[in-house]
Amino acid sequence: GCLTQLYENAFFRGGDVASMYTPNAQYCQMRCTFHPRCLLFSFLPASSINDMEKRFGCFLKDSVTGTLPKVHRTGAVSGHSLKQCGHQISACHRDIYKGVDMRGVNFNVSKVSSVEECQKRCTSNIRCQFFSYATQTFHKAEYRNNCLLKYSPGGTPTAIKVLSNVESGFSLKPCALSEIGCHMNIFQHLAFSDVDVARVLTPDAFVCRTICTYHPNCLFFTFYTNVWKIESQRNVCLLKTSESGTPSSSTPQENTISGYSLLTCKRTLPEPCHSKIYPGVDFGGEELNVTFVKGVNVCQETCTKMIRCQFFTYSLLPEDCKEEKCKCFLRLSMDGSPTRIAYGTQGSSGYSLRLCNTGDNSVCTTKTSTRIVGGTNSSWGEWPWQVSLQVKLTAQRHLCGGSLIGHQWVLTAAHCFDGLPLQDVWRIYSGILNLSDITKDTPFSQIKEIIIHQNYKVSEGNHDIALIKLQAPLNYTEFQKPICLPSKGDTSTIYTNCWVTGWGFSKEKGEIQNILQKVNIPLVTNEECQKRYQDYKITQRMVCAGYKEGGKDACKGDSGGPLVCKHNGMWRLVGITSWGEGCARREQPGVYTKVAEYMDWILEKTQSSDGKAQMQSPA
């Protein structure tokens, strides 16, 4: 299953399959997730070690048993790959690292006014993998405001150095935020020239293209089909690059197929997994296990559940079958691709779905009544769980926010439905940033069921929580995925990094905002909150947030939206925007429904509705 816990001051001994430099443990974990054999990782922050060569070291590890002995090492951080973790799997990494220089091949230098502009330039450059930016206060005047675009053979820095007034980060191409755009076409009977960066075996050009998309240096590819004239090159997928970023030449060639990486696609990237099953095909590799199962789909599920399994072959040979069950060969290789592909067999083959991020897998995400007062504009994919609840009567308008917590579930405030309990009038928009982008053609979800907490009463502030079951499940993308729910009765965690988002009013007597707003607000103790609201009962089922001096708060139209807090690199839904005295008034914090107190209710309702849980609190 999915294991998300991090181990502080611990280092896994042995099992090394690769090492690299990464700026933090989260990036190291992501590299482990996408490495075909990595199950565990250990990271050494700069503060944890004197050896300059091992600072920022990220060590990727494998283990036949799925675990390794942990040794104590002050400052080290260890953890698990996020393979099998569904919507948590993402190659997108938005963080900017201050005081750090990520080294690589500097291939472009320009003057820019901010680190955000530098990151944007990197994201819009086909070869840029990461960047460094010298701030206005950098010690050498001639380097100030320099934006250095970089790449390296492995896509990670060749070294990371602590350096004042330098900020570094990664391209946001894996976040589907590139402005370059991509070539979706696949070209039959065409071979591309240029430099081969890797060679793998794949059953078709689509798998070749997906592997290219997630390979750090692949810009385009050529695939040799299973009827290519040279037998030893059949099913070979050549991952390629060039100085210019495009093929310098292409040659008409029977039984070859070529195409481009989809990393520069805007708004949608292919999943990093291959779900098609190939009948009549055997995949060769190192044997992990052999089991008898009924049907090829069960074989694929078995492979997916066995975390080290990368691909499988289900044999239909009479000698491999007993009654209705046949042998399911679970296999792996060094690069995650078959070492041999044979056609015209009595088998069916395919890949593990451990890196699919759309599965019904329901663990929480680690990534990352309308304008927030004192907030700033959000960016694409920053709050992918935020939804807009809109009512269509004669006109259509935004009324409330909500949070996506599963493929078919949204959590919001009960008071959003006061006077509007009819599910037909509601339209739910997910994966959006600007309300003005919504047109008559914009897809929306309709409501199958509104479940208001049984103890909620109109005009009272208690139990202000409601679940919405959508008519159809939503697919997860970088811009539309769920927020993790807290553990039941989560009282011990001290949250210091909390944000409220919404399209609500920017002042008490304001109007709905176009761009999703965000504001960083500290939590306030219930005792402090009760002092500020002496006419109301602040219960343990509420949580308060706000600045003593006011100025930043949720407001009308933000209702039902999320109060999220980041803890150990993971976002959790701590509160649901509920009520407050005015907006952003001095010493009048916002009051939110405390989600942890309603976990039993949420799980009961989401399970009873269709027999199985659709979301889960973290492990």
Partner: antibody, heavy 119, light 107 residues
Framework: EVQLLESGGGLVQPGGSLRLSCAAS????????MVWVRQAPGKGLEWVSY????????QYADSVKGRFTISRDNSKNTLYLQMNSLRAEDTAVYYC????????????WGQGTLVTVSS | DIQMTQSPSSLSASVGDRVTITCRAS??????LTWYQQKPGKVPKLLIY???SLESGVPSRFSGSGSGTDFTLTISNLQPEDFATYYC?????????FGGGTKVEIK
């Protein structure tokens, strides 16, 4: 030039049998998956069956499973569809088609042969 | 089995119009989607494979897009010879299934 030519269609009574043939030329027949697709009068397209290049793997639509058998003779560059226990709802134009390598689309189609099941 | 739902089932348009036909799969099919054109009494003709790749010899006014479950065929500048029935087909898993078809008629 790739060519596919079906034959063997005609009028048959319910419960009867027919064998369709598809002669292929202009490409390496033994390298390709081949399929049968049918189209009832005035209706849409329905995939019937496919066969792997060596003939070792076959699959069928539920509507014909157990009644139809797909086969091939690579030495004769010919695809076959043996249809038994025919029903009125099997009345259609039957097309043989080549499955394009890697995309599983049907890139070349025969002109079709009409099978009418009626008493 | 994967169901393919095409919409609309028919549409009337004029020469020069931009026409959009959509196809929705009942489960994710990645990019394994094909579009065909069929004229009355004729054999289906492959237009678009791999969701967006134009078959050789097909005019560039035809384009395909989408991945996962939602796909679109667009004819940017409808010509007299484009009046026909269009079918989508998933090639992700057997049974390979076709959409019900969209008949493009002259207004």
């Amino acid at each position: 030039e790739v060519q596919l030519l079906e034959s063997g269609g005609g009028l048959v009574q319910p419960g009867g049998s027919l064998r369709l043939s598809c002669a292929a030329s202009g490409f390496t027949f033994s390298a390709y998956y081949m399929v049968w697709v049918r189209q009832a009068p005035g209706k849409g397209l329905e995939w019937v069956s496919y066969i792997s290049p060596s003939g070792g793997q076959t699959q069928y639509a539920d509507s014909v499973k157990g009644r139809f058998t797909i086969s091939r003779d690579n030495s004769k560059n010919t695809l076959y569809l043996q249809m038994n226990s025919l029903r009125a709802e099997d009345t259609a134009v039957y097309y043989c088609a080549r499955e394009a390598i890697s995309s599983s689309s049907f890139d070349y189609w025969g002109q079709g042969t009409l099978v009418t099941v009626s008493s | 089995d994967i169901q393919m739902t095409q919409s609309p089932s028919s549409l009337s348009a004029s020469v020069g119009d931009r026409v959009t036909i959509t196809c929705r799969a009942s489960q994710r099919i990645s990019y394994y989607l094909t579009w065909y054109q069929q004229k009355p009494g004729k054999v289906p003709k492959l237009l678009i494979y791999a969701a967006s790749s134009l078959e050789s010899g097909v005019p560039s006014r035809f384009s395909g897009s989408g991945s996962g479950t939602d796909f679109t065929l667009t004819i940017s500048n409808l010509q007299p010879e484009d009046f026909a029935t269009y079918y989508c087909q998933q090639a992700f898993s057997t049974p390979f299934t076709f959409g019900g078809g969209t008949k493009v008629e002259i207004k």
